[in-house]
């Protein structure tokens, strides 16, 4: 008859490191002690007649274990398989690029170390919930990949890696891990430049706004610009509107940086950069200045006047230009009482980058000069009838300006000059019109007739 | 009846091998374990490990682990065991003893005595 | 490891005397215990099996008895021949372990 050594359980599955009791027993009624064959840890826990108990502990992979027994003169032996578990130690996803260019393809990448048995761990890598590919684990450690086309919607979507041992169907349930997520960013820079608004020309100390925009831009608000005069970065203010980033910023030049110079507009965004570059020119444009050798001049004395400005400035003096570009203009006039209250004017002509650009500056001279009443605004004879309203229309010149009073002979009767007055008899006679300043006086002999009124 | 036969004494010089055997007669050599058993002169038993015939199962005394390799011909019913590296520490008397179980040795051999000198 | 302790180391005897041998286990063993006889220059020779079994071919008067961690060895009526080293061994775990003996010696 032959005899059957059972091992109990069968065939089981546990948890790695786990500890398993496995029982062997047979019918053989004149049985020795029953072995355990195995390269787990054992211990003997118990035995009796034809049965002994074990203690496996420290289960870390799978095992044949075997039950081995004399019985009538021969061996018997049998057997059973431990499938171990063991949930993946470590369930990575690779880092994803900082950023992703949309439309093009990128690598989602998942590494598995561990896990056990192979035969039922599937990995799925996730955008959000949503499973992108499910594939079996397979060697050690399992790397899993799935290409995907990068969308504007990806655009900060959490991307993960999940392992799904299947234990199921040993009734043990489904073991799931995921993996940390990484954020997915993407962006779309058009190939096209920023389109950069800035003026050709740029005086020293003088400040012009400076526009620099990009359209097509995604995410706008991730975007990085950069704007600067030369080596000068220039404080920007950027704005987004829908896909369109606008930076405004002004442009103040300095002293140092005058002669040919760049503006330039960089915007970065995904590791990428468009730029802009536009030519200006940063000039000085001193003047022009126009200069008295006296502001206020004597009557007859000799009068300069000069009219400077920067380098390279051509000037004109009244119509006379000066010999060269940077040079001054200089004219020089004998002081007469017609120059007063004369203006020179002196107009300055730099040429910046084939433009040519004006200014104009002016001068007034005061030339000093004696009192005089003009004879023709003053009437020497005057007939008035008596009780009419009239005016005394005498104009005096001079620098200062003098005053101005006619007083009658042999009186201090005066009467007003350039004001509607009242005429009677007593204001008949010869009067005394005298114009007074610091520089002297000017006298004319007024007569005044006045024809007494018809009695009725 | 039972015997077992162990072959004869070793000379070895240190860091040699050595290789014994112990042929098995009068049972079925599959059906019995088969221990080594150590004695060095003067002194106690030291159990180094067993070998089951029927499965080529071997369990070890973790002492002797790097030391001692157990194993057995079945066509000639003879177990064998190979010591290396072989120091002073290693001259004894090595025993075979079988049994019906794989806790205990009924039947013995004689002994191979193995004395390693330079 | 499962330390097999020993007493005595030496026993004197006189032929025909009643003797105990004992051997102590630093844990439960249950009855996986042997019992070895070693004559001078000769190989061991199981007398006791399992605390208590009878090996065929071993005289009636040794006898066995004991379970968990004390043991014991009788010999009833010493003969001039049982003269040797008694070595007790452990068998429930391995790996398997011997005492140190008990030397038994005439008197």
């Known amino acids: 008859q032959e005899f059957l050594l059972r091992v109990e359980p069968q065939n089981p599955v546990l948890s790695a490191g786990g500890s398993l009791f496995v029982n062997c027993s047979t019918d053989c009624p004149s049985s020795e002690k029953i072995a355990l064959e195995t390269s787990l840890s054992k211990e003997l826990v118990a035995s009796g007649m034809g049965w002994a108990a074990f203690n496996l502990s420290n289960v870390t992979g799978n095992s044949r274990i075997l039950c081995s027994v004399y019985c009538n003169g021969s061996q018997i032996t049998g057997s059973s398989n431990i499938t171990v578990y063991r949930l993946p130690e470590r369930v990575e996803l690779a880092p994803l690029p900082p950023w992703q260019p949309v439309g093009q393809n990128f690598t989602l990448r998942c590494q598995v170390e561990d896990g056990s048995p192979r035969t039922s761990l599937t990995v799925v890598l996730l955008r959000w919930e949503e499973e992108l590919s499910r594939q079996p684990a397979v060697e050690e450690p399992a790397e899993v990949t799935a290409t995907v086309l990068a969308s504007r919607d990806d655009h900060g979507a959490p991307f993960s890696c999940r392992t799904e041992l299947d234990m199921q169907p040993q009734g043990l349930g489904l073991f799931v891990n995921t993996s940390a997520p990484r954020q997915l960013r993407t962006f779309v820079l058009p190939v096209t430049p920023p389109r950069l608004v800035a003026p050709r020309f740029l005086e020293v100390e003088t400040s012009w706004p400076v526009d620099c925009t990009l359209d097509g831009l995604f995410p706008a608000s991730e975007a990085q610009v950069y704007l600067a005069l030369g080596d000068q970065m220039l404080n920007a203010t950027v704005m987004n509107h829908g896909d369109t980033l606008t930076a405004t910023a002004t442009a103040t030049a300095r002293a140092d940086q005058e002669g040919a110079r760049e503006i330039v507009c960089n915007v970065t965004l995904g590791g990428e950069r468009r730029e802009a570059r536009e030519n200006l020119t940063v000039f000085s444009f001193l003047g022009p200045i126009v200069n008295l050798s006296e502001p206020t001049a004597h009557e007859g004395s000799t009068v300069t006047v000069s009219c400077m400005a920067g380098a390279r400035v051509q000037v004109t003096l009244d119509g006379v230009p000066a010999a060269a570009p940077g040079q001054p203009a200089q004219l020089q006039l004998n002081a007469t009482e017609s120059d007063d209250g004369r203006s020179f004017f002196c107009s300055a002509t730099l040429e910046v980058d084939g433009e040519f650009l004006h200014r104009n500056s002016s001068v007034q001279l005061r030339v000093l000069y004696g009192p005089k009443i003009d004879r023709a605004t003053c009437p020497q004879h005057l007939k008035w009838k008596d009780k009419t309203r009239h005016v005394l229309q005498c104009q005096a010149r001079g620098n200062p300006y003098p005053e101005l009073r006619c007083l009658k002979e042999g009186s201090s009767r005066e009467v007003p000059v350039g004001i509607p007055f009242f005429v009677n008899v007593t204001h008949n006679g010869t009067y005394q019109c005298q114009a007074s300043s610091s520089r002297g006086k000017y006298t004319l002999v007024v007569v005044m007739d006045i024809e007494a009124g018809s009695s009725h | 009846q039972v015997q077992l036969q162990q072959s004869g004494a070793e000379l070895a010089k240190p860091g040699a091998s050595v290789k014994m055997s112990c042929k098995a007669s009068?049972?079925?050599?599959?059906?019995?374990?088969m221990h080594w058993v150590k004695q060095r002169p003067g002194q106690g038993l030291e159990w180094i490990g067993y070998?089951?015939?029927?499965?080529?199962?071997?369990e070890y005394n973790q002492k002797f682990k790097d030391k001692a390799t157990l194993t057995a011909d079945k066509s000639s019913s003879t177990a064998f065991m190979q010591l290396s590296s072989l120091t002073s520490e290693d001259s004894a008397v090595y025993y075979c003893?079988?049994?019906?179980?794989?806790?205990?040795?009924?039947?013995w051999g004689q002994g191979t005595l193995v004395t390693v000198s330079a | 490891d499962i330390v097999m302790t020993q007493s005595p180391a030496t026993l004197s005897v006189t032929p025909g005397d009643r003797v105990s041998l004992s051997c102590r286990a630093s844990?439960?063993?249950?009855?996986?215990l042997h019992w070895y006889q070693q004559k001078s220059h000769e190989s061991p020779r199981l007398l006791i099996r399992?605390?208590?079994q009878s090996i065929s071919g071993i005289p009636s008067r040794f006898s066995g008895s004991g379970s968990g961690s004390d043991f014991t060895l009788s010999i009833n009526n010493v003969e001039p021949e049982d003269v040797g080293v008694y070595y007790c061994?452990?068998?429930?775990?391995?790996?398997?372990?011997f005492g140190a003996g008990t030397k038994l010696e005439l008197k």
């Open positions: 399992y605390a208590s």
């Open positions: 061994q452990n068998g429930h775990n391995f790996p398997l372990t």
């Open positions: 844990q439960s063993i249950s009855d996986y």
């Open positions: 003893a079988s049994s019906r179980d794989a806790y205990h040795g009924t039947y």
């Open positions: 070998i089951n015939p029927n499965t080529d199962y071997t």
């Open positions: 009068g049972y079925t050599f599959t059906t019995y374990w």
